[in-house]
């Protein structure tokens, strides 16, 4: 089953992601962006569990290899950043667990490729425009809301999940 | 269930100044922004401003800096609203709105409004 | 400051009608693949709700009846087929720049 603390601590790594702002988000209005959040891919109808926990995976995965790069460690508090990190590797190694657990119990593909391959292309899109703006605080600040919103659609999907046990 | 609960009606003298609060529960008072909003009667709506009260970080409307002061008590998850030097045209209802959907800035749920009526 | 200027200020439309309203803004509140307008709807004695935001989503727990559209300075809310329930004023509100502003707001009656 994919445990509660897994949603708790996702909770909590939204809660440190919100006191990590060092900005005012008002003064950085003129530099939102649509990074194209692949919301279907959150959508837990439409797959099987152990697919499910593979997207939930790659997006934290993908989550923590952005926070964990140099430009991230100059843009954040660093005690912070440090709870933010142990915090998503801790649901990392969560998901795993649960995969290994779901594996023998589905006869499905362990990957949703498609899915696998949305989440990529959208933190793509997100480095690409950091580098754009030149890892600006703005850019930053931009960028710490689009993962609160994207770590809240992985929190539903979750709870999606959760359902169906 | 997310719940914002404000004060009572007021009523006040021209020159005085007022303070009203919005009780939250329900969710997490300090991660969301809490937007302030006038409606005078019969008339639309007008944003104040917005506060942090996990910082305590505050942005006015221009038109509102002198007049509205936004501060937000997070052990007592509550937001307060001061308005000074009132006047007639402060008469109106005074919403407090959670912020939602994060840097989209749109407004989710809302208080029921506390009615300040100036008056001599 | 952005000025919406909402069109008509009240319509009357009959039971299972299209009610169309209109927001123009002063200004585009359009910018990278985002339109920042959002949609109220206010009945007598309540408080405003969330119906749509980013000119075309539909917010959680709204009927599907209600649809926004529009980019840059020009954005429809459409009410097809409209319900008795659906009689009340309804608001734009941009955040696309500071300070953030509402329409004058459009008062729907039902025939």
């Known amino acids: 089953d994919l445990p509660q603390t897994h949603s708790l601590g996702n909770r909590r790594a939204l809660i440190l992601l919100a006191q990590m702002g060092r900005i005012s988000p008002f003064s950085c209005l003129k530099d939102r962006r649509d990074f194209g959040l692949p919301q279907e891919e959150f959508d837990g109808n439409q797959f099987q569990k152990t697919q499910a926990i593979s997207v939930l995976h790659e997006m934290i995965q993908q989550t923590f290899n952005l926070f964990s790069t140099e430009d991230s460690s100059a843009a954040w508090e660093q005690s912070l950043l440090e709870k933010f990190s142990t915090e998503l590797y801790q649901q990392l190694n969560n998901l795993e667990a649960c995969v290994i657990q779901e594996v023998g119990m589905e006869e499905t593909p362990l990957m949703n490729e498609d899915s696998i391959l949305a989440v990529r292309k959208y933190f793509q899109r997100i480095t690409l425009y950091l580098t754009e703006k030149k890892y600006s605080p703005c850019a930053w600040e931009v960028v710490r809301a689009e993962i609160m919103r994207s770590l809240s659609f992985s929190t539903n999907l979750q709870k999606r999940l959760r359902r169906k046990d | 269930q997310v719940q914002l609960q404000e004060s009572g009606t007021v009523l006040a003298r021209p020159g005085a100044s007022v303070k009203m609060s919005c009780k939250a529960s329900?969710?997490?008072?300090?991660?969301?922004?809490m937007h302030w909003v006038k409606q005078r009667p019969g008339q639309g709506l007008e944003w104040i401003g917005v506060?942090?009260?996990?910082?305590?970080?505050?942005t006015y409307n221009q038109k509102f800096k002198d007049k509205a002061k936004l501060t937000a008590v997070t052990s007592a998850n509550t937001a307060y609203m001061e308005l000074s030097s009132l006047t007639n045209e402060d008469s109106a209802v005074y919403f407090c709105?959670?912020?939602?959907?994060?840097?989209?800035?749109?407004?989710?749920?809302w208080g029921q409004g506390t009615t300040v009526t100036v008056s001599s | 400051d952005i000025v919406l200027t909402q069109s008509p200020a009240s319509l009357a439309v009959s039971l299972g009608q299209r009610a169309t309203i209109s927001c123009r803004a002063s200004?585009?509140?359009?910018?990278?693949?985002?339109?920042?307008m959002h949609w109220y709807q206010q009945k007598p004695g309540q408080t405003p709700k969330l119906l749509i935001y980013?000119?075309?989503n539909l917010e959680s727990g709204v009927p599907a009846r209600f649809s926004g559209s529009g980019s840059g300075t020009d954005f429809t809310l459409n009410i097809h087929p409209v319900e008795e329930e659906d009689a009340a004023t309804y608001y734009c509100?941009?955040?696309?720049?500071?300070?953030?502003?509402f329409g004058s707001g459009t008062k729907l009656e039902i025939k």
């Open positions: 709105t959670r912020n939602y959907k994060y840097d989209y800035y749109t407004m989710d749920y």
């Open positions: 329900g969710y997490s008072f300090t991660t969301y922004w």
């Open positions: 506060i942090y009260p996990g910082n305590g970080d505050t």
């Open positions: 200004k585009s509140v359009s910018t990278s693949g985002h339109s920042y």
């Open positions: 980013l000119a075309s």
């Open positions: 509100q941009h955040s696309g720049e500071l300070p953030f502003t």
